[in-house]
């Protein structure tokens, strides 16, 4: 099944340490998640206690859609994803979604092990899926250059990767996992403009075309391709709608996008 995501009037605060919030969210998740028969994820009037990191956020994504989330540094983009994952709990509002989530963090990481292990560890191996992901994340050429190919060991005593290679492996790990909802938090770090454009097309737009995706991005090209756009500014929803609706806005919104 694919998923739909809804957030209604969601507000959230960073009042306590992250760990305490994480524990609270797990124990108290009746506030966070409501059963949703039609497999949807939605945010409704979502906020937290103290100074809100998110205030009155609303959006809805249909199954298979791409939501682009933009905003300057500190606007609340990562916090939004954390709420969907249950690592941050709303003080008010509703988030609805169901199914499995796969998350690609902003800062990519590599586990000690082979390239292949880094992508498929803990997930059943499917040759066709694996090859498709490797190709879409532009890892084929990198892998072909290593004598041991994808059995090349990374980490201690192994190969040291560039930031761009790390980012692509991290994305491949998230995409290879079969999930209903993919949360991609600025996944193209360290990539040059051309590579980013190609991977966005081949991976996010084509390979994942039927999946529900939330992409944190500041790139205009990504916004154009998204089904819906949410621009956050200081924790609030500055804009929510389609790209054509965004174009009709008179004020200059670029300062809200770039961080």
């Amino acid at each position: 099944t694919t998923t739909e995501v809804v957030m209604e009037n969601v507000t959230a605060f960073w009042e306590e340490g992250f760990g305490e919030l994480f524990e609270k969210a797990k124990q108290n998740n009746n506030n966070r998640k409501t059963s949703n028969g039609d497999d949807s994820l939605f945010f409704s009037n979502f906020s937290l206690l103290g100074t809100p990191v998110l205030k009155d956020i609303n959006f809805k994504i249909e199954r298979g859609q791409l939501l682009a989330v933009a905003g300057s540094t500190g606007a609340g983009k990562t916090s939004l994803l954390m709420m969907i994952m249950g690592e941050l709990e709303p003080s008010e509002g509703k988030i609805k979604h169901s199914g499995r989530i796969s998350f690609c963090p902003q800062f990519s990481w590599i586990m000690p092990g082979t390239i292949k292990e880094n992508i498929i560890f803990g997930v059943s191996y499917d040759e066709y899926r694996y090859r498709s992901v490797i190709k879409a994340c532009q890892l084929e050429e990198d892998i072909s250059k290593f004598p041991e190919k994808d059995n090349t060991v990374l980490g201690e005593g192994g190969i040291t990767l560039s930031g761009g290679q790390r980012a692509r492996i991290s994305l491949a790990r998230a995409v290879y996992k079969d999930a209903d909802l993919y949360l991609l938090d600025s996944p193209f770090g360290y990539l040059d403009v051309l590579t980013e454009k190609e991977i966005f097309e081949s991976c996010v737009c084509k390979l994942m075309a039927n999946k529900t995706r939330i992409l944190v991005t500041s790139k205009m090209e990504h916004l154009k391709k998204a089904d819906k756009i949410l621009i956050l500014h200081e924790g609030s929803s500055y804009f929510y709608g389609t790209f054509s609706e965004l174009q009709n806005l008179q004020p200059d919104f670029s300062s809200k996008l770039m961080g």
């Epitope: 989530i101 796969s102 963090p105 800062f107 990481w109 590599i110 586990m111 790390r166």
Partner: nanobody
């Protein structure tokens, strides 16, 4: 720098259970992932279970359904509950943590787990 301290290893009979604990101290504000690796005599160190940001937990095939990884983020601890232990689970178990923007790995000293009757 990050320091890791494991505990909970020991000798257990086949079918028995153990719970390993690992406490992280130091620069633990930017943890990307935590987990457990093991190294059996004469073999390479291999991943057993990993918990990363977003609550993603993954397990090696031989331990699925028997081992459970959990985290206490407030105290920077990671646990490995090992049930239905088999002789082939005998190994030194290492706590592993990946942190920082440049993906730095830190390891514990290891704790011995022996499954034998």
């Amino acid at each position: 720098q990050v320091q890791l301290q494991e505990s909970g290893g020991g000798l257990v009979q086949p079918g028995g259970s153990l719970r390993l604990s690992c406490a992280a101290s130091g620069s633990t504000s930017s943890i990307n992932a935590m987990g457990w690796y093991r190294q059996a005599p004469g073999k390479q160190r291999e991943p057993v279970a990993i918990s990363s940001s977003g609550g993603d937990t993954r397990y090696a095939e031989p331990v699925k359904g028997r081992f459970t990884i959990s985290r206490d983020n407030a105290q920077n601890k990671v646990y490995l509950q090992m049930n239905s232990l088999k002789p082939e689970d005998t190994a030194v178990y290492y706590c592993w943590l990946n942190w920082g923007r440049t993906s730095v790995n830190s390891w514990g000293q290891g704790t011995q787990v022996t499954v034998s009757s």
